[in-house]
Interface confidence: medium
């Protein structure tokens, strides 16, 4: 039975040209996290594999940095980066947990950032 829950940074906004941290946190389960995928719509951005470490998609290697933790840092944001992002936790024995984040990249110089939380 899957008992875990995923907390995310929720809906966030950032300024064009800036950077943003996408974070998810899996709690309420003792399952082992074997891999975390970060995806944007149908595109794979990055993978953090428990055995192999971080792999960044070649298409995004110039603008995506691993971490902090299992999170992902997006840099040099453009308006085209606006959209849904998913953290997909592959766990054993529970299975797969998915979290959703919506990012809005704003043209203006003032961007309200959503609530952040620290991952211990």
């Amino acid at each position: 039975m899957m008992t875990g829950t995923i907390e995310t940074t929720g809906n966030i906004s950032a300024e064009k040209g800036g950077s943003i941290i996408l974070q998810c946190h899996l709690s309420s389960t003792t399952a082992q996290v074997t891999q975390v995928n970060w995806e944007q719509q149908d595109q794979l951005l990055a993978i953090c594999n428990a055995d192999l470490g971080w792999h960044i998609s070649p298409s995004f290697k110039d603008r995506v940095a691993p971490g902090p933790g299992l999170g992902l840092t997006l840099q040099s944001l453009t308006v085209n980066d606006t959209g849904e992002y998913f953290c997909i936790y592959h766990t054993y024995p529970d299975g797969t947990y998915t979290g959703r984040i919506f990012l809005e990249v704003l043209e203006s110089s003032v961007a309200e950032h959503g609530a952040r939380f620290q991952i211990p």
């Epitope: 082992q32 891999q35 794979l44 993978i47 594999n49 428990a50 055995d51 192999l52 792999h55 054993y92």
Partner: nanobody, 125 residues
């Protein structure tokens, strides 16, 4: 940290067979796919075959029907059975590991960041 060690290379006559092995150690979960690559003298490294998520397999056109990839999870070992070998199969063969995901069944080396040291296969009469 995952470490990969290949073995089984050597000298074989055209038309002959070899079986390469790649032993994996240092893993915690084994949640990754594995592939075989080769690099001939003076040429770029190219993909040969891979075992992907769901146990699917893929082969380059040049080896399809002659080579067979397999994986024994109980022994943490990847194999490449090579039959009907040709002179153009001469190369250093490498095994490599990459994260497991549903779109991973290709032979691009981009996602492979963990490599063995290679084993030399020479096909010559």
């Amino acid at each position: 940290e995952v470490q990969l060690v290949e073995s089984g290379g050597g000298l074989v006559q055209p038309g002959g067979s070899l079986r390469l092995s790649c032993a994996a150690s240092g893993y915690k979960y084994g949640v990754y796919s594995m592939g075989w690559f080769r690099q001939a003298p003076g040429k770029e490294r190219e993909g040969v075959s891979a075992i992907c998520s769901g146990g699917r397999t893929t082969y380059s056109d040049s080896v399809k029907g002659r080579f067979t990839i397999s994986r024994d999870n109980s022994k943490n070992t990847l194999y490449l059975q090579m039959n009907s070998l040709r002179a153009e199969d001469t190369a250093v063969y490498y095994c490599a590991a990459r994260p497991l995901w549903t779109g991973d069944c290709d032979l691009s080396s981009s996602w492979y960041k963990t490599w063995g040291q290679g084993t030399l296969v020479t096909v010559s009469s």
